[in-house]
Interface confidence: low
């Protein structure tokens, strides 16, 4: 299998994640999911003991040479080797295709075959706990052991025959080598083919490294422990059928005595440490909706009680290539609208018994700021704004326009890039804010783009509450109140006085307060008051009044 990309740092789900347990695991830990065992979501593999050097070894009979250094052990695995590869191993390096569960050995060893080595054949039916290679079904010893030929001085003079027998568990060898030592001290080596039946290993030795997969039945809420052996073993009290121990209750220890006709007493006593029921754990998304665009929170929840020691339960998360040994993780400063993949597993006594993967898409982020192209008023009651939309996802726009302390907002379709504002007030400064928003887990508003314009001038409204009062025989006092709408930049009050169709006075004041003197007596006058805003006059307010006959 080709190497996969190795992302750095927290990556989105676009990056393939590395296996969660690819980092060194503690001794006695099952490696993460290289096997069909872990294609079942809630399986659980357990190695009950560490690899023993006695599991597969080269044994020398008690009659062997006194001087052990006389052996040339080149090509023969020593007793310290946790696993002796089969001759098939050297021909079939099929890493990654083995269907057995990887179990922890004393050093979590994974030994590859050495090319050209004289490998003692593995035992059919013996489960390899530390190798990724499949066991070859052929078991005869394919090479003979080699004695040192270079030094006869090292060998004491003896006349007895010494038989060196290589054993691997219950292998039955069909070849052996006999060394006859002559009285002169020289070694005469002859190879004969004889049928030797070595003593059987003890079942305790043979099954020292048995692995167990726990299969959970969600209906019965009971576990089945599957013993990973190739032969049909016998269990004390007939507790197993077809290498399976059924109806195991969560959080209870069960003892199984394992025997087989290929091994002798003592039997292997296997302690099954049953994990909690997998449905008692739930991977919960604990992300706050307000922050769901840039954060992810994942938390394992215990949704039911159990009697297992919670201190034996550990949690592991991997998101990208970041690994967390926490029950709850919070990832921050993420990209909005990105898929992030997090894998998680729960271990009981360092053995995985359930796992879950979540691909979480961060929520839509706040949209970007629209780019206003222009914003202006071309009439007294109208304005126009045009813009380019933001690049991030959004649902709609909100356009607000503020005049003085009044604020009006409109919801605009996402496809609009121009809006004509109607019914505006003349000669009024409008501040416009335009933002995009998206309705996600919560509504997120983008940054607002701002602009402003002042509408064109328009005629002001009428002055009001106009009064004309006589102050003397030939004098009048004219007053009025300002117009409600000035609609222009300036403020000036005008008074026109007419007699018949003749304009007799035209005055302009800052305030609407006029004193008209020296009028003719007993004359009808028309008084017209209006407001001028610098651009337009307003409609005049008209009152008629007559001077009296002179009292003198």
């Amino acid at each position: 299998q080709s190497p996969t990309p190795s992302p750095t740092g927290l990556t989105t789900a676009k990056m393939p994640s590395v296996p969660l347990s690819s980092d060194p695991l503690p001794t006695h830990t099952t490696a993460f999911s290289p096997a069909s065992t872990f294609e079942r979501e809630n399986d659980f593999s357990e190695t009950t003991t560490s690899l023993s050097p006695d599991n597969t070894s080269t044994q020398v009979s008690p009659d062997s040479l006194d001087n052990a250094s006389a052996f040339n052990t080149t090509g023969v695995s020593s007793v310290q080797t946790p696993h002796l590869p089969t001759h098939a191993d050297s021909q079939t390096p099929s890493a990654g295709t083995d269907t057995q569960t990887f179990s922890g050995s004393a050093a979590n060893a994974k030994l590859n075959p050495t090319p050209g080595s004289n490998a003692i054949s593995d035992v059919p039916g013996e489960r390899s706990t530390a190798s990724t290679f499949p066991t070859d079904p052929v078991s005869p010893l394919t090479t003979t052991l080699s004695l040192a030929h270079h030094s006869s001085a090292a060998l004491p003079a003896r006349t007895s025959n010494t038989t060196i027998t290589a054993n691997t568990s219950d292998a039955y060898l069909n070849a052996s080598e006999t060394t006859t030592l002559s009285p002169s001290g020289s070694a005469v080596i002859s190879t004969t083919t004889i049928a030797t039946t070595p003593s059987k290993p003890t079942c305790d030795e043979k099954y020292a490294n048995i692995t167990v997969d726990y299969l959970y039945n969600k209906e019965t809420k009971l576990f089945t422990a599957k013993l990973n052996v190739n032969e049909n073993v016998e269990c004390g009290n007939n507790t197993c059928t077809n290498n399976e121990v059924h109806n195991l209750t969560e959080c209870k220890n069960a003892s199984v005595s394992i025997s087989h006709n290929s091994c002798t007493a003592p039997d292997k006593t296997l302690i099954l440490d049953v994990p909690p029921g997998v449905e008692k754990f739930q991977l919960h998304d604990c992300t706050q909706v307000e922050k769901a665009d840039t954060t992810i929170c994942l938390k394992w929840k215990n949704i039911e009680t159990f009697t297992c020691d919670t201190q034996n339960i550990t949690y592991r998360f991997q998101c990208g290539n970041m690994i967390f040994d926490n029950k709850e993780i919070k990832l921050e400063n993420l990209e909005p609208e990105h898929e992030y993949k997090c894998d998680s597993e729960i271990l009981y006594n360092n053995h995985k018994f359930t796992n879950a993967s979540k691909i979480i898409k961060t929520d839509f982020g706040s949209p970007g700021e629209p780019q206003i192209i222009f914003c202006r008023s071309e009439a007294a009651h109208q304005g126009v704004i045009t813009w380019n939309p933001p690049q991030r996802s959004f649902h709609n726009f909100t356009l607000c326009y503020i005049k003085e302390t009044e604020k009006d907002c409109l919801n605009l379709d996402k496809n609009l890039i121009k809006y004509d504002l109607q019914n505006l007030k003349p000669y009024t400064k409008y501040v416009l804010s335009l933002h995009a928003y998206i309705i996600a887990k919560v509504q997120r508003n983008g940054s607002a783009a701002m602009c402003h314009f002042t509408t064109k001038s328009a005629p002001p409204s009428q002055v009001w509450n106009m009064t004309v009062s006589m102050t003397s025989d030939n004098s009048m006092h004219v007053k009025c109140r300002p117009p409600r709408d000035r609609n222009g930049p300036h403020e000036r009050y005008h008074l026109e006085v007419e007699a018949g169709n003749t304009l007799v006075r035209n005055e302009s004041h800052k305030n609407c307060d006029f004193r008209v003197k020296d009028l003719q007596y007993s004359t009808d006058y028309t008084f017209k008051a209006y407001f001028h805003n610098g651009d337009y006059p307003g409609e005049p307010f008209i009152l008629h009044h007559s001077t009296s006959y002179n009292s003198k």
Epitope: P16, S17, P19, L20, F32, E339, D343, I359
Partner: nanobody, 119 residues
Framework: EVQLVESGGGLVQAGGSLRLSCAAS????????MGWFRQAPGAERVVVAI???????YYVDSVKGRFTMSRDNSKNTVYLQMNSLKPEDTAVYYC?????????????WGQGTQVTVSS
């Protein structure tokens, strides 16, 4: 196990187009994540595009707007349409799958197809 076979690579001038195909056999891949990766000489294999089983597609920034990944579930095939090719797109292109309950990573790599973009 899924077997993947890529095809469609070749020599093309800068600005040209190619369409890569990845035919899957052994399993229907419609419900699995599929990815296109590439490996330039002397460099690591890197992701180009991923079609998630949920329907969304990811593109690395350098190919956004130029490359399009699609699926034809009836043919059990994924495609990578590559337009506006640049010399820096020269690499061996691989497709890969991430099945639900097997590896946590993309796996079942094909043999790859060479894409060479000349300037």
């Amino acid at each position: 196990e899924v077997q993947l076979v890529e095809s469609g690579g070749g020599l093309v001038q800068a600005g040209g187009s190619l369409r890569l195909s990845c035919a899957a056999s052994g399993r229907t891949v419609s419900r699995y994540d599929m990815g296109w990766f590439r490996q330039a000489p002397g460099a690591e294999r890197v992701v180009v595009a991923i079609s998630w089983s949920g329907g969304s597609t990811y593109y690395v920034d350098s190919v956004k707007g130029r490359f399009t990944m699609s699926r034809d579930n009836s043919k059990n095939t994924v495609y990578l349409q590559m337009n506006s090719l640049k010399p820096e797109d020269t690499a061996v292109y691989y497709c890969a799958v991430r099945t639900e309950r097997s590896s946590l990573d993309f796996h079942s790599w094909g043999q790859g197809t060479q894409v060479t973009v000349s300037s």
